[in-house]
Amino acid sequence: KAMHVAQPAVVLASSRGIASFVCEYASPGKATEVRVTVLRQADSQVTEVCAATYMMGNELTFLDDSICTGTSSGNQVNLTIQGLRAMDTGLYICKVELMYPPPYYLGIGNGTQIYVIDPEPCPDSDF
């Protein structure tokens, strides 16, 4: 009855600091309310990056000031994290919780290592 969550092992952020990955879960029950949370793990410290709750069949909505956006389709969530810099390189864990109806189920992915490389500043051009 454990819920399994799959996510890619490694993702490289774009030069604009955007990283996208898919978080897929195998649901042990018929949930109508699902909560998706992205956690960042660094030096055994875990912090919450963003979270969203959605009703099955509806769109995933993060808070307006969130650095995350996403879309959902069945048991699959497409997550995008924006505004990343080199210092944000780390392990990003997808956590899925089936909130309603009871019982509650938890699923934690193994994490996606996101590598962020700050773009080189453009050299001054003399024309």
Epitope: K1, E48, L106
Partner: antibody, heavy 120, light 108 residues
């Protein structure tokens, strides 16, 4: 440092009510799910209830469902457990515990507990 | 509801010895969702291990956890005087969150 201090325990007659409080400090209370866990004298641990960090979801053990209500006041950094229709088998030390960021069901910090005795 | 059983009920050992505590689940628990707690008389429990094998902050490395599926183990490599206590396993993968009945580690 994280601190959780329970209060409100005491001796109460069967069928009566009691409200427990848990005062939190040392962390951002509104960011964490919170639990009540109890331990009958000389017995093991039993999870009682959880409330999500934003109060949106609450779950209860079958043994207390319909009788106990968990709630929180984030402005006061306080967790509550309203216990109605108390029974002798509710006699226990009641602990409040913080759920971790990684998983709400991991109890990473505990209070020292408050004793509730249900007896006529 | 996932029922957890622990064995042995009591473990009598001497300081310096190795302690091996077992926790068995009535149905499969992903290894990510099992925790161990230590409780001393008159005190609140303390988190030792989560995710079956990850040590909580400040827990000495003589404590280690292992296992998967339905069988989990807490090992204390060399017992220190302060390790004599009751140990509980707990699953947090689904509600209701459940504890095992505990194993008491006492001094031989």
């Amino acid at each position: 440092q994280v601190q959780l201090v329970e209060s409100g325990g005491g001796v109460v007659q069967p069928g009566r009510s009691l409200r427990l409080s848990c005062a939190a400090s040392g962390f951002t209370f509104s960011s964490y799910g919170m639990h009540w866990v109890r331990q009958a004298p000389g017995k093991g641990l039993e999870w009682v209830a959880v409330i999500w960090y934003d109060g949106s979801n609450k779950y209860y053990a079958d043994s207390v469902k319909g009788r106990f209500t968990i709630s929180r006041d984030d402005s006061r950094y306080t967790l509550y457990l309203q216990m109605n229709s108390l029974r002798a088998e509710d006699t226990a030390v009641y602990y409040c515990a913080r759920g971790s960021i990684l998983a709400a069901g991991i109890f990473d910090y505990w209070g020292q507990g408050t004793l509730v005795t249900v007896s006529s | 509801e996932i029922v957890l059983t622990q064995s042995p009920g009591t473990l009598s050992l001497s300081p310096g010895e190795r302690a091996t505590l077992s926790c068995r689940a009535s149905q499969s628990v992903s290894s990510s969702y099992l925790a161990w707690y230590q409780q001393k008389p008159g005190q609140a429990p303390r988190l030792l291990i989560y995710g079956a094998s990850s040590r909580a902050t400040g827990i000495p490395d003589r404590f280690s956890g292992s296992g998967s599926g339905t069988d989990f183990t807490l090992t204390i490599s060399r017992l220190e005087p302060e390790d004599f206590a009751v140990y509980y396993c707990q699953q947090y993968g689904s509600s209701p969150f459940t504890f095992g009945p505990g194993t008491k580690v006492d001094i031989k």
